[in-house]
C-alpha cells in the first residue's frame, strides 16, 4: 500500500461581510463564499470546534456608534468599541462548541435606524485544529 | 487496510493568566487548564518548537507601570509598554527551542510592591506546525 | 503495516526584512533565511496558496512617509498609513495564487530619495493549509 503524504483537513475559518447595522440590534452578516468551513445561522457565526480563534474585525460606519461582538450569553464581549466611526481590530479568544458570535450595536441618535457600513468584514480562523469538534 | 483521514497533531499553544505583578520582577503566571500543549516553568512559558508564534497580551493594572515581555537574554522584548495602566496587544514573533517567555515590570512609585491585574491574560499559539520541536 | 502519526507539511510563511525604502517606489525586501517556504521575486512576496494570511508589519523610518502594502493591481491596500514615522500593525487578509505582496512609498519632501528603515520586518503566515496551492 503506497502511503500518500498526509494532507491538512480544512481549517475552520470564515469571512463574513456586513453592509448594514441596525440600532439596538446587530449587523446583518452574509458569507460571500459557499466554500466556508463555518456557517452563519440567525445572523450569528456558529462555533463547532473548541480552541483559540484569530478574530479580525473591520469597517467604516456612516454614523457614530457603539459596537460589541459577543460569543456567549452572560460573558463579556470579544470586542467592545464606544462611540466610533470605524473599527480595525484583531484579537485572539478561546471559543467552544455551542458558542455563537454575533453583534450588538447602539447609535447615539434617534434620527436614524440603519447604519451603512463600508468594508464591513469579520474573519474567524481556528488556531487549534486537532481539538474537539462537534457538527 | 482502511485509511482514516489524518488528524492534526495538537498545536503548541497556551493561555496563562496573571492577577499580580511585582515591581522589579514580573507577573505571576498560572495556566488554568491542564490540557495546554505548552508548559510554565519558573514563571516562564517554555518554547519547545521553532517557528512563528501569535502572541496576545491583555490586562488592566491597578497602578501605572512599565511592562516588557522577553523571550531570550540579550534580545529586545516582544512587547514593551511604558507607563501604562492597561494593555491589549497582538504580535507575531519567531521563537525557538530553549526560548522562555517571561515578564519584566517596573512601577514608578516606591509606595507599593505588588500591582493587582484585572483580566491579565497571555496567549501564545504556534503558527508553524511541522517544524523542529524538541521535548 | 505500521501507521506513523501524520506530520504537518510545512506551513507557507516568510519573514522579510527591509532597511531602505525609495520615494515613489517601494521598500527593498530581503529574506534572511534560506528555509522560508515562500519566495521573494522582483521585490514582491509571491503567493502560491489561496487562503487567509496573518500579516505583521513593523518598522521605524528616518523620514515621515506614506506607506501602503498592496497585493493585487486594482485592489485596495492591505495596509495604508499616511504621514507616519513608524508602523507596528497586524492584519488578516485573504490572498490567492498569483497575488504579489509589495510596498508603495511616498515621502512629502523633495530633498531626499531614500528612507532608512530601522527594524523593518514583514511577516506573512498562511492560515489555511489544505487549501489550493500552485507552484
Amino acid at each position: 500500500l503506497q502511503q500518500v503524504p498526509p494532507q491538512y483537513p480544512p481549517i475552520q475559518s470564515i469571512r463574513v461581510q456586513f453592509t448594514r447595522c441596525e440600532n439596538e440590534k446587530g449587523c446583518i452578516i452574509t458569507s460571500p463564499s459557499k466554500d466556508e468551513t463555518m456557517k452563519v445561522q440567525d445572523n450569528s457565526i456558529i462555533i463547532n470546534c473548541d480552541g483559540f480563534y484569530l478574530i479580525s474585525l473591520k469597517g467604516y460606519f456612516s454614523e457614530e456608534l457603539s459596537l460589541s461582538l459577543y460569543y456567549r450569553k452572560g460573558r463579556g464581549p470579544l470586542f467592545s468599541l464606544s462611540k466610533v466611526t470605524s473599527v480595525d481590530s484583531i484579537g485572539v479568544a478561546y471559543l467552544a462548541f455551542k458558542d455563537k458570535v454575533y453583534f450588538n450595536v447602539t447609535t447615539h441618535s434617534t434620527s436614524y435606524k440603519d447604519i451603512q457600513v463600508n468594508g464591513g468584514e469579520l474573519i474567524l480562523i481556528h488556531q487549534n485544529p486537532g481539538g474537539f469538534c462537534a457538527y | 487496510l482502511q485509511q482514516v483521514p489524518p488528524q492534526y497533531p495538537p498545536i503548541q499553544s497556551i493561555r496563562v493568566q496573571f492577577t499580580r505583578c511585582e515591581n522589579e520582577k514580573g507577573c505571576i503566571i498560572t495556566s488554568p487548564s491542564k490540557d495546554e500543549t505548552m508548559k510554565v516553568q519558573d514563571n516562564s512559558i517554555i518554547i519547545n518548537c521553532d517557528g512563528f508564534y501569535l502572541i496576545s497580551l491583555k490586562g488592566y493594572f491597578s497602578e501605572e507601570l512599565s511592562l516588557s515581555l522577553y523571550y531570550r537574554k540579550g534580545r529586545g522584548p516582544l512587547f514593551s509598554l511604558s507607563k501604562v495602566t492597561s494593555v491589549d496587544s497582538i504580535g507575531v514573533a519567531y521563537l525557538a527551542f530553549k526560548d522562555k517567555v517571561y515578564f519584566n515590570v517596573t512601577t514608578h512609585s516606591t509606595s507599593y510592591k505588588d500591582i493587582q491585574v484585572n483580566g491579565g491574560e497571555l496567549i501564545l499559539i504556534h503558527q508553524n506546525p511541522g517544524g523542529f520541536c524538541a521535548y | 503495516l505500521q501507521q506513523v502519526p501524520p506530520q504537518y507539511p510545512p506551513i507557507q510563511s516568510i519573514r522579510v526584512q527591509f532597511t531602505r525604502c525609495e520615494n515613489e517606489k517601494g521598500c527593498i525586501i530581503t529574506s534572511p533565511s534560506k528555509d522560508e517556504t515562500m519566495k521573494v521575486q522582483d521585490n514582491s512576496i509571491i503567493i502560491n496558496c489561496d487562503g487567509f494570511y496573518l500579516i505583521s508589519l513593523k518598522g521605524y523610518f528616518s523620514e515621515e512617509l506614506s506607506l501602503s502594502l498592496y497585493y493585487r493591481k486594482g485592489r485596495g491596500p492591505l495596509f495604508s498609513l499616511s504621514k507616519v514615522t513608524s508602523v507596528d500593525s497586524i492584519g488578516v487578509a485573504y490572498l490567492a495564487f498569483k497575488d504579489k505582496v509589495y510596498f508603495n512609498v511616498t515621502t512629502h519632501s523633495t530633498s531626499y530619495k531614500d528612507i532608512q528603515v530601522n527594524g523593518g520586518e514583514l511577516i506573512l503566515i498562511h492560515q489555511n493549509p489544505g487549501g489550493f496551492c500552485a507552484y
Epitope: S62, T85, S109, N118, G119 | - | G76, S80, S82
Partner: antibody
Framework: EVQLVESGGDLMKPGGSLRLSCVAS????????MSWVRQAPGKGLQWVAY????????SYADAVKGRFTISRDNAKNTLYLQMNSLRAEDTAIYYC???????????????WGQGTLVTVSS | SYVLTQLPSKNVTLKQAAHITCGGD??????VHWYQQKLGQAPVLIIY???SRPTGIPERFSGANSGNTATLTISGALAEDEADYYC??????????FGEGTQLTVL
C-alpha cells in the same frame, strides 16, 4: 438630524478667487471625512476635493489640482473650499457631502447639502 | 481613468418596471452606488454596494451588478420616481467616478 448648509456662491470673473463654506450640524463633525462635489448646469456630478476627519489628508480631482484648496475648522463645524484662478468651466452648483475615509476599499456619499451656485463669466 | 457609461434618457410607463444600466470595464469586480436627483434638488443615495438600500428608500428600488453592466431596477415606477439617476464607483486613482446620468421619464 444631519444638516449640511453651503454658502459663498457668487458670480465671479475668470481668474478670480472665492471661498465656499459648509456648516454641519446634527453629528460629530470632527469624526467624519468630507468632500465637495460639483454639477455644471445641465451636466452630471463630478467629485472635486476630499478632506480627512482631522484635516491632515486631502486629495483633489485633476481638474482643480493646484487651484482649489479644501480645509476644515472642526471647532466651528465648518468645511471650506478656497477656489483660486477660476475658469468658466468651474461654473457649477457646489455640494458638500459626507463620506468615508479614502483608505477604505470602497466609497460613496451618503449625506448631501443643498448646494451653492458658483458662476464664472466675463 | 475609469469610465462609466449611461444612456442619457429612458422612458417608462407608470407602474411598469424600469431598468437603468451603467456600463464599465469589468464593473462586476467593483461596487456600484446609485443616486437619485430630482429637479432642483440635491442628489440622494438610493443604493450602495450594488444592492443595499439605505434607510427610507422604498423596496421597489433594487440593484444588481455583474460582468460589464450594473443595473438599477425600479419594480413599479411611480410619478415621484421621475428624476436623474447616477451610478458611481470608487477608483483608487480617480477616487469617486460618476456616470453621466440617465434622465427617467414616467409616462
Amino acid at each position: 438630524e444631519v444638516q449640511l448648509v453651503e454658502s459663498g456662491g457668487d458670480l465671479m470673473k475668470p481668474g478670480g478667487s472665492l471661498r465656499l463654506s459648509c456648516v454641519a450640524s446634527g453629528f460629530t463633525f470632527s469624526s467624519f471625512p468630507m468632500s465637495w462635489v460639483r454639477q455644471a448646469p445641465g451636466k452630471g456630478l463630478q467629485w472635486v476635493a476630499y478632506i480627512h476627519s482631522g484635516g491632515s489628508s486631502t486629495s483633489y480631482a485633476d481638474a482643480v489640482k493646484g487651484r482649489f484648496t479644501i480645509s476644515r475648522d472642526n471647532a466651528k463645524n465648518t468645511l471650506y473650499l478656497q477656489m483660486n484662478s477660476l475658469r468658466a468651466e468651474d461654473t457649477a452648483i457646489y455640494y458638500c457631502a459626507r463620506t468615508f475615509p479614502t483608505v477604505a476599499a470602497d466609497n460613496w456619499f451618503y449625506y448631501w447639502g443643498q448646494g451653492t451656485l458658483v458662476t464664472v463669466s466675463s | 481613468s475609469y469610465v462609466l457609461t449611461q444612456l442619457p434618457s429612458k422612458n417608462v410607463t407608470l407602474k411598469q418596471a424600469a431598468h437603468i444600466t451603467c456600463g464599465g470595464d469589468n464593473i462586476g469586480s467593483k461596487s456600484v452606488h446609485w443616486y437619485q436627483q430630482k429637479l432642483g434638488q440635491a442628489p440622494v443615495l438610493i443604493i450602495y454596494y450594488d444592492s443595499s438600500r439605505p434607510t427610507g428608500i422604498p423596496e421597489r428600488f433594487s440593484g444588481a451588478n455583474s460582468g460589464n453592466t450594473a443595473t438599477l431596477t425600479i419594480s413599479g415606477a411611480l410619478a415621484e420616481d421621475e428624476a436623474d439617476y447616477y451610478c458611481q464607483v470608487w477608483d483608487s486613482s480617480a477616487k469617486w467616478v460618476f456616470g453621466e446620468g440617465t434622465q427617467l421619464t414616467v409616462l
